[in-house]
Interface confidence: low
């Protein structure tokens, strides 16, 4: 239904707190360099304006679109050109081009310092003084670093943060209460960020159809008792919600997400038997809970899939009559039978099926041609299963840090032209898959591993797109989203790469490394490892292990020495010489 004033409608639907939070996220995601205070001022102005429209929908400007209202606010910021350069050119455009322009200027890797958590005492003081401002800072800092973060989900994480602080700031030992809990929220939020970025990439690069296919597969796995019409309805609604969030329409996105949660809870009988616990929760927790609800029990009486999709003599007729519906049904039927497959794998299988029908339905004897299609799926299924087994075995043998190093060597060999910081970030993220997925039950490993790896590789592609340096990476990133992970896995040593010359300063360390937190120490060592591989791309695992063990021993010795500086300056050159010899 059309509303006289869109802004009044959204303010009424969302309520002041969520309205303000979402406007703050929107501004922070568009203008990533502005301070919290600058954005907070804009948010207050927009909120005050929304209230005047709630009081009188016919008041001046209340009939304007949200893009127009928000865009005008952003474009009125002083010194926009000095701070944002060419982004200021967006303000010369009219809607909807202006919003598209803002979206194109979102930076996936802004030049901002890492978000450092203050110490417990200071955090609790500022939280107690002004909880609203404290949470505003959290929303601002996360949103500007993650310009595609799923906005309603970010409100959920802010709520989690709030609850943790409320609880822990009342304890005697605030630090030991806060640290593990906030670390847990941070880890979940980072995973949520890369997953959502993948969804927006899917939408941006391949359109709504691609995202809807993803949604059909995912929802069919989770709700195998829902019929195809129900799954299609949910997938259509979910596609709309994600399209809005990816497009910067955060108020509409959050409002529609709340509507979808409401619909699901009102229709549990036709969707899933597992929703009640989620539906008993308040809004943000309810929507979050529904998004990761456990799979419903698969119906016991599902017939073999071949009957409808291989053995039926009408396959080509059914396909020709409504291609998308027929393929959607195939994806639904396959996915509801395989909660143990990754969505990426299911989409590859559907793509294979589509290609087979396109080819076979044009031939003289189609059934003979498409009759073997299920056997052709086997290698497609075996490949990721083998990947999971090999990598989880390696993770169990090496632990997370060692596993990250193995991946770092592998990926540096595949794409040595990529910058070392990018390779280290990617390998550390890819390596976390072990901790995240390899401890899960067997049937959950494959979906966990492959869909997580796909999301991380999507980030690699986004970063590489801005600075294309490796033909290997360009090749894998240019294809469809679901083929990326197999493409990266299949890459071997880049034979075209000319090894980097050995520079002693790259491997020269100082005593300041001793006082770094463990994570930073690991990054320093992993940076050195990547540089070693760039120097000797064909070094054996044994050679690299020898050098890294020597390096670890050197750090351990010098960091324990009475005169650290002298130890580093005398032992350092010896280490460099030994490294060169070991790799010669």
């Amino acid at each position: 239904e059309a509303h006289k004033s869109e802004i009044a409608h959204r303010y009424n639907d969302l309520g002041e707190q969520h309205f303000k939070g979402l406007v703050l996220i929107a501004f922070s995601q568009y203008l990533q360099k502005c301070s919290y205070d600058e954005h907070a001022k804009l948010v207050q102005e927009v909120t005050d304006f929304a209230k005047t429209c709630v009081a009188d929908e016919s008041a001046a400007n209340c009939d304007k679109s949200l893009h127009t209202l928000f865009g005008d606010k952003l474009c009125a910021i002083p010194n926009l050109r000095e701070n944002y350069g060419e982004l200021a050119d967006c303000c010369t455009k009219q809607e909807p081009e202006r919003n598209e322009c803002f979206l194109q200027h979102k930076d996936d890797n802004p030049s901002l310092p890492p978000f450092e958590r203050p110490e417990a005492e200071a955090m609790c003081t500022s939280f107690k003084e002004n909880p609203t401002t404290f949470m505003g800072h959290y929303l601002h800092e996360v949103a500007r670093r993650h310009p595609y973060f799923y906005a309603p989900e970010l409100l959920y994480y802010a709520e989690q943060y709030n609850e943790i602080l409320t609880q822990c700031c009342a304890e005697a030992d605030k630090e030991s209460c806060l640290t593990p809990k906030l670390d847990g929220v941070k880890e979940k939020a980072l995973v949520s960020s890369v997953r959502q970025r993948m969804k927006c990439s899917s939408m941006q690069k391949f359109g709504e159809r691609a995202f809807k296919a993803w949604a059909v597969a995912r929802l069919s796995q989770t709700f195998p008792n829902a019929d195809f019409a129900e799954i299609t309805k949910l997938a259509t609604d979910l596609t709309k919600v994600n399209k809005e969030c990816c497009h910067g329409d955060l108020l509409e996105c959050a409002d529609d997400r709340a509507e979808l949660a409401k619909y699901m809870c009102e229709n549990q009988a036709t969707i899933s038997s597992k929703l009640q616990t989620c539906c008993d929760k308040p809004l943000l927790k309810k929507a979050h809970c529904l998004s990761e609800v456990e799979h419903d029990t698969m119906p016991a009486d599902l017939p073999a899939i071949a009957a409808d999709f291989v053995e039926d003599q009408e396959v080509c007729k059914n396909y020709a009559e409504a291609k998308d519906v027929f393929l959607g049904t195939f994806l639904y039927e396959y996915s509801r039978r395989h909660p143990d497959y990754s969505v990426s794998l299911l989409l590859r299988l559907a793509k294979k099926y589509e290609a087979t029908l396109e080819k076979c339905c044009a031939e003289a004897n189609p059934p003979a041609c498409y009759g073997t299609v299920l056997a052709e799926f086997q290698p497609l299924v075996e490949e990721p299963k083998n990947l999971v087994k090999t990598n989880c075995d390696l993770y169990e043998k090496l632990g997370e840090y060692g596993f990250q190093n193995a991946i770092l060597v592998r990926y540096t060999q595949k794409a040595p032209q990529v910058s070392t910081p990018t390779l280290v970030e990617a390998a550390r993220n890819l390596g976390r898959v072990g901790t995240k997925c390899c401890t899960l039950p067997e049937d959950q490993r494959l979906p966990c591993v492959e869909d997580y790896l796909s999301a991380i590789l999507n980030r690699v592609c986004l970063l590489h797109e801005k600075t294309p340096v490796s033909e290997h990476v360009t090749k894998c990133c240019s294809g469809s989203l679901v083929e990326r992970r197999p493409c990266f896995s299949a890459l071997t040593v880049d034979e075209t790469y000319v090894p980097k010359e050995f520079k002693a300063e790259t491997f020269t360390f100082h005593s300041d490394i001793c006082t770094l937190p463990e994570k930073e120490k690991q990054i320093k060592k992993q940076t050195a490892l990547a540089e070693l591989v760039k120097h000797k791309p064909k070094a054996t695992a044994e050679q690299l292990k020898t050098v890294m063990d020597d390096f670890a021993q050197f750090l351990d010795t010098c960091c324990k020495a009475a005169d650290k500086d002298t130890c580093f300056s005398t032992e350092g050159p010896n280490l460099v010489t030994r490294c060169k010899d070991a790799l010669a």
């Epitope: 060419e86 890797n109 030049s111 032209q417 990529v418 910058s419 910081p421 990018t422 600075t467 294309p468």
Partner: nanobody, 116 residues
Framework: EVQLVESGGGLVQEGGSLRLACAAS????????LGWYRQGPGNERELVAT???????SYADSVKGRFTISRDYDKNTLYLQMNSLRPEDTGLYYC??????????WGQGTQVTVSS
């Protein structure tokens, strides 16, 4: 610390040409956008032209058809070819490199003066 050094500025007659160059002191792998900016006497710094790593270019309306931005990947250098220069093109020209992993880099600037 990587430095950007502009060169090629100078005094030129109206209608003349200049080619500005901006060289980085070392290879920068994490570039995502390169640009030329200028600051005329008593004016704010303004965007002249940008080029992405995929070589798509964008120009200010006032220089379209007269200026061409380009880059030499191997030499790590950004160029601005300026033809049909006008007095209003006078100013200090800066190059900027927007990076993916580090903060953006600005050059010190090179002076361009167009006499009528």
């Amino acid at each position: 610390e990587v430095q950007l050094v502009e060169s090629g500025g100078g005094l030129v007659q109206e209608g003349g040409s200049l080619r500005l160059a901006c060289a980085a002191s070392e290879r920068i792998w994490d570039i995502n956008l390169l640009g030329w900016y200028r600051q005329g006497p008593g004016n704010e710094r303004e965007l002249v032209a940008t080029i992405t790593v995929g070589d798509s270019t964008s120009y200010a309306d006032s220089v379209k058809g007269r200026f061409t931005i380009s880059r030499d990947y191997d030499k790590n250098t950004l160029y601005l070819q300026m033809n049909s220069l006008r007095p209003e093109d006078t100013g200090l020209y800066y190059c900027k490199i927007r990076r993916t992993w580090h903060s953006e880099l600005w050059g010190q600037g090179t002076q361009v003066t167009v006499s009528s």
